[in-house]
């Protein structure tokens, strides 16, 4: 079977600071040197791109400076962190992996990680 399998956790709870981390692991059918990882958010039937990064195997994963994502890579495993999340960002976050080079191109899409974000309660005013 030449299809690429992508695994990611089913559920992740964001921290009180709005940070969520999860691992995206892929079983590569070929020896890719250039890999593109994209995080997609699916809400209802709408799919939007959250962030994306292309990296050379053995090198670090670099997202754009203004991206809400950071990440590290190790072999066929990518550790992704999404920051600045709020309760309204709760949803299904899909890891998409593309083997860009050398040919042939392969696409792999995970089943998605449901990220739950709970806005912290505002601190009550304290009277002294």
């Amino acid at each position: 079977c030449k299809a690429m399998h992508v695994a990611q956790p089913a559920v992740v709870l964001a921290s009180s600071r709005g940070i969520a981390s999860f691992v995206c692991e892929y079983a590569s059918p070929g020896k890719a040197t250039e890999v593109r990882v994209t995080v997609l958010r699916q809400a209802d039937s709408q799919v939007t791109e959250v962030c994306a990064a292309t990296y050379m195997m053995g090198n670090e994963l670099t997202f754009l400076d203004d991206s809400i994502c950071t990440g590290t890579s190790s072999g066929n495993q990518v550790n992704l962190t999404i920051q600045g999340l709020r309760a309204m960002d709760t949803g299904l976050y899909i890891c998409k992996v593309e083997l860009m080079y050398p040919p042939p191109y392969y696409l792999g899409i995970g089943n998605g990680t449901q990220i739950y974000v709970i806005d912290p309660e505002p601190c009550p005013d304290s009277d002294f």
Epitope: C1, M4, H5, L40, V47, T48, E49, K96, M100, L107
Partner: antibody, heavy 118, light 107 residues
Amino acid sequence: QVQLVESGGGVVQPGRSLRLSCAASGFTFSSYGIHWVRQAPGKGLEWVAVIWYDGSNKYYADSVKGRFTISRDNSKNTLYLQMNSLRAEDTAVYYCARGSLLGPFDYWGQGTLVTVSS
Amino acid sequence: DIQMTQSPSSLSASVGDRVTITCRASQGISNYLAWYQQKPGKVPKLLIYAASTLQSGVPSRFSGSGSGTDFTLTISSLQPEDVATYYCQNYNSAPWTFGQGTKVEIK
């Protein structure tokens, strides 16, 4: 709404060249890979070429490799297909199609007919 | 390259009939399979992706199943507006190959 509009088709002699264009609107063009797909008269769909969102990667069907070149101008929201050394078997309706974020082709243009004949 | 083979190449059925079209990939493509509908003289339209996920706005009488190499498109109750040619497509890897198409007609 998402729109793809092809142009540039016509009748051309074997061995000559033609350039097709695909004007996109209604979405962030620079975020999507775009494909060319063709359909010979009375035949099925044949994938021709794709170009990545930023133009960094291109793939071609074996039948057009070395003769066709796909390109894009993100500042003009336009995709191109330069077709050289045209053959009779290249006669087809040429569609541009958007590769969705999840992979399949979710929006298609209306197509432009290319006829290669002497 | 992955070859996609559809069967039958054409079929004729009555309104209300259940219609099944099969698509076989020459090697495993997991669930990276799409189905398209092309009505006569019209542009192809995405019906189903990920083998079984209905594209937004597509009637629920259409369904897809399968994984690996064998896939099925089912129309649970054929309607006159379903007269079209249906294509399966691999999008697991390049090239993005299509099946040869199945023409559906009304008896």
